[in-house]
């Protein structure tokens, strides 16, 4: 056989040395170069010439080393599906989209295709923090001891109870998971019908 270092070269077992940057071309029974990201095959390889690549036209891309004869068309992020753009399309990368604030990915096919509104977390709970924003719906967890959250909201966080003594006040009513501590001026008694958190 003829030992050759660069494509096109003969392949008896139908595999190529560099699987990422080369591919097996079955008609000629050889290994040929793939085209780099941002390009496509403008002329196929043969035993006498390697693949000829050309740059993707504007508004098209190829992300990987490939032997595609066309570039993929750039697609905008669809706001109707709840998506927004985080990075524009380039010849080497498709448009990068994510779910709009307050939404999560409800349909995933290699990438997010449809976002839905995050569920509200009821008072006394907050959304569990996730590694990646928009990846899944809210999972509401109770506020930890000494914290409260008093709204129905997809994004409100549990806050620490007010420490009355830090403000020179005294506790009138203890805080709960759904309400803050009620403080009062140490010199005045708090009328029972008053529900404000602080009385000065």
């Amino acid at each position: 056989s003829q030992p050759q270092a660069v494509p096109p070269y003969a392949s008896e077992n139908q595999t190529c040395r560099d699987q990422e940057k080369e591919y097996y071309e079955p008609q000629h029974r050889i290994c040929c170069s793939r085209c780099p990201p941002g390009t496509y095959v403008s002329a196929k390889c043969s035993r006498i010439r390697d693949t000829v690549c050309a740059t993707c036209a504007e508004n098209s891309y190829n992300e990987h080393w490939n032997y595609l004869t066309i570039c993929q068309l750039c697609r905008p992020c669809d706001p109707v599906m709840g998506l927004e753009e985080i990075a524009p399309c380039t010849s080497k990368r498709k448009t990068q989209c994510r779910c709009q604030p307050g939404m999560f990915c409800a349909a995933w096919a290699l990438e997010c295709t449809h976002c839905e509104l995050l569920s509200d977390c009821p008072p006394g709970t907050e959304a569990e923090l996730k590694d990646e924003v928009g990846k899944g719906n809210n999972h509401c967890v109770p506020c930890k001891a000494g914290h409260f959250q008093n709204t129905s909201s997809p994004s409100a966080r549990c806050q620490p109870h007010t420490r009355c003594e830090n403000q020179g006040l005294v506790e009138a009513a203890p805080g709960t998971a759904q309400s803050d501590t009620t403080c009062k001026n140490p010199l005045e008694p708090l009328p029972p019908e008053m529900s404000g958190t602080m009385l000065m």
Epitope: S1, Q2, A10, E12, P26, Q27, H28, R29, S46, R47, I48, R49
Partner: antibody, heavy 120, light 107 residues
Framework: EVQLVESGGGLVKPGGSLKLSCAAS????????MYWFRQTPEKRLEWVAT????????YYPDSVKGRFTISRDNAKNNLYLQMSSLKSEDTAMYYC?????????????WGQGTTVTVSS | DIKMTQSPSSMYASLGERVTITCKAG??????LSWYQQKPWKSPKILIY???RLADGVPSRFSGSGSGQDYSLTISSLESDDTATYYC?????????FGGGTKLEIK
Amino acid sequence: EVQLVESGGGLVKPGGSLKLSCAASGFTFSDYYMYWFRQTPEKRLEWVATISDGGSYTYYPDSVKGRFTISRDNAKNNLYLQMSSLKSEDTAMYYCVREENGNFYYFDYWGQGTTVTVSS
Amino acid sequence: DIKMTQSPSSMYASLGERVTITCKAGQDIKSYLSWYQQKPWKSPKILIYYATRLADGVPSRFSGSGSGQDYSLTISSLESDDTATYYCLQHGESPWTFGGGTKLEIK
């Protein structure tokens, strides 16, 4: 001893169909790419079709693409060429040919040929 | 398609004579050229592959040379058994294409 024996040739009217067969013996048929070549009455040699060792890939020149279909049965050691929409220019001797399976890609064995005549 | 121009189309030569047939490719075919001998009423038979390599069982009086676009088949000392038509074939790029053939006869 490698043997390739073609059959199925004959006289057919323009627009008609014909199926050629090639019985292979003396080698491991499923290890080789197989071809059909033809030789016109003017003695010009032409490539007609290629099929890969496992039968997954088939290739044709533009002159027969869409009209001819190459296939193989590795269990029976048989190669086939289904020809349809035949034209007078398809008149030729058809050869079943083996491509060597090393790195030089030459055609090491040819059958004796079968004659196809397309005429009204 | 790569055009293969073979010459001469026919020739007469004497026994013992040195005979050369040439083939010119329309572009560089990087030695992916083989030579075939066809006797009357027989199928083609491989003589030379990869431009210069002698196929198994072929007499050593046959040899091939050339590179790039230009190739030749030489019979060093013609024998009566060499009466035949000789074809070159490029298999560097599909579609594979043959030369028009050279009909060799004894004077």
